[in-house]
Each structure stands twice: as structure tokens, then as C-alpha cells.
């Protein structure tokens, strides 16, 4: 089992859309998938959860954060739009 985050480090303009890529390879047909982030102050935050049928984000994600779970591509991408300066962090995909 493995997770691959293909996106390089990204510097994007405030107000734009960013898609953080995550693909997974597992024998499980319905894995639990997660996004977490570590902010510049080293705080660790849960961002999003999803499986084949639903997804749920932390309170701060409402309105601007979403996930795109592309089952045909075994992908669980995190979409931030519009992105803000306070979104700066290192984002991790896991399952």
C-alpha cells in the first residue's frame, strides 16, 4: 500500500485555485483517506477525510476547501479555492 503526492512545492497567488495531488495504491476497495497539514507554527491539523461515498472537512475548511475523489484514478486531491495566505502549510495525504 502506498500514497503518492506528485505536486511539487507550490507558490500560488492569493485568490487562485490550487489542487494538491494525491494518488493511492491499495488492495482495499474502500479505503479511509485523509489530508492533514502542518502550519508554519508547527501546529498539526486534520483537514479532510473521505471514502468512496462521502467526505468531511474540519470546520476551517468550510466554503474554500474540498476534495476530489476520482475513483477511476485512485485519486484523493485537495482543492483550495480561493487560496489565502493563511493556508500556507505542508499538506500530507494519508490512509
Amino acid at each position: 500500500d502506498k500514497v503518492t503526492q506528485s505536486s511539487p512545492d507550490q507558490t500560488v497567488a492569493s485568490g487562485s485555485e490550487v489542487v494538491l495531488l494525491c494518488t493511492y495504491d491499495t488492495v482495499y476497495s474502500n479505503p479511509d483517506l485523509f489530508w492533514y497539514r502542518i502550519r508554519p507554527d508547527y501546529s498539526f491539523q486534520f483537514v479532510f477525510y473521505g471514502d468512496n461515498s462521502r467526505s468531511e472537512g474540519a470546520d476551517f475548511t468550510q466554503g474554500r476547501f474540498s476534495v476530489k475523489h476520482i475513483l477511476t484514478q485512485k485519486a484523493f486531491h485537495l482543492v483550495i479555492s480561493p487560496v489565502r495566505t493563511e493556508d500556507s502549510a505542508t499538506y500530507y495525504c494519508a490512509f
Epitope: 505536486s7 511539487p8 476530489k68 477511476t72 485519486a75 479555492s81
Partner: antibody
Amino acid sequence: EVQLQQSGAELVKPGASVKLSCTASGFNIRDTYMHWVKQRPEQGLEWIGRIDPANGNTKYDPKFRGKATITADTSSNTAYLQLSSLTSEGTAVYYCSEGIYFDYWGQGTTLTVSS
Amino acid sequence: DILLTQSPAILSVSPGERVSFSCRASQNIGTIIHWYQQRANGSPRLLIKYASESISGIPSRFSGSGSGTDFTLSINSVESEDIADYYCQQSNSWPYTFGGGTKLEIK
């Protein structure tokens, strides 16, 4: 089985508009992105734009903005490409595809713009 | 926009030879590049995703490499059925772009 079925060939006059369709089976378009790609005769591939059918959010190559409009109907699992004010430059094969990378493609719709 | 430059425009090789297609990006795109094959009168077909990841159902003779700005698609032993146009495509930033393509001919 995943399939993308596109509408049939079109012959339209210069200045007219046309709406092409792409119906997906084997997956729900809400869960992915739907793209349109143009290929003029004997030319390469050009990305027109994409839609996120879950929310209607679209992205276009600037050269197609104002000429192309991408929409989606999740109830029929279909994406559409509307082309307006067509000229001979619009004569091409138009493909739909899905995802971040394009692992599934429609068979293409041939559009001919001629008087 | 990210410009993808493919070279050469035409490659002519003999069956059984190894062939490499080049794709150069105008700026760093990490490994967010994909390769497609398009045979005459057909729809494109995905060969390689994310620069080097293989695709189920694609013959193992196809491989990809590279990161940053320089990428390569290789066919380690060309067969006659490989006659086609080959395109690279980036999905790192908007707008998505394709390279101009390389036509593979068999001698």
C-alpha cells in the same frame, strides 16, 4: 466499464453556434473533472478547458475564453461544449476526457464549419 | 502558460530499435506530466502518468523518466503497431497544455 460517448458529427455555417455532448458511463462525473480537447486537421492537441461537475467551476485556456462554454448535467452524467460565433478555424475533432490526467477519452466529434 | 516543446518533430526508426521522445517544459513542473499515443484516426491513449508511472494495459516496452523541465518517453523495442503521434501534457498549472507532438515512423 468506463466509457465516454460523444455526439455525432456536425456541419454548421460560419457565425453559427453548436453544442456538443459527452455522456459518461461506468462512473459519476460529479467525482471527477471533465475536459474538452480540440484537434484541427493534421494538427496537434489543444486543451480547451474543464469543468468540475460537482460545483460547475470551470477553467479555460485564455484563447478559448468567450468562444467556448463548458457545462455539465449531473442528472444525465453528461458534459457539454458550446462553441459560438464559429469560423473555419473551428473545423476540428473535439474530444472529451476526464480526470487530472486523461485516462479515458471519447471517440471524438467532427465539427465542420463551412458555408 | 507553460510551454511544452517536443523534439524532434519526426522520428524514423527500424523495428526492434530503442527510441526516445523528448519533452521540455518552460518552467519547473515537478513530475506532473503525462504521455499519450494517438494512432491514425483514433483517440489519444494514455501511456505514462506523472512522468514515470506505468498504466495498466500498456505494454512494458513503454517507459517514462524525468522531472523539473526535461522529460523522456522511451520505447525499448519498437514494433510496427507503435506508428503514431506522441504527445506530452502537463497538468501542473492552468491552462493545461500539450506539446506539439512527435510523429513516429518505421523505416
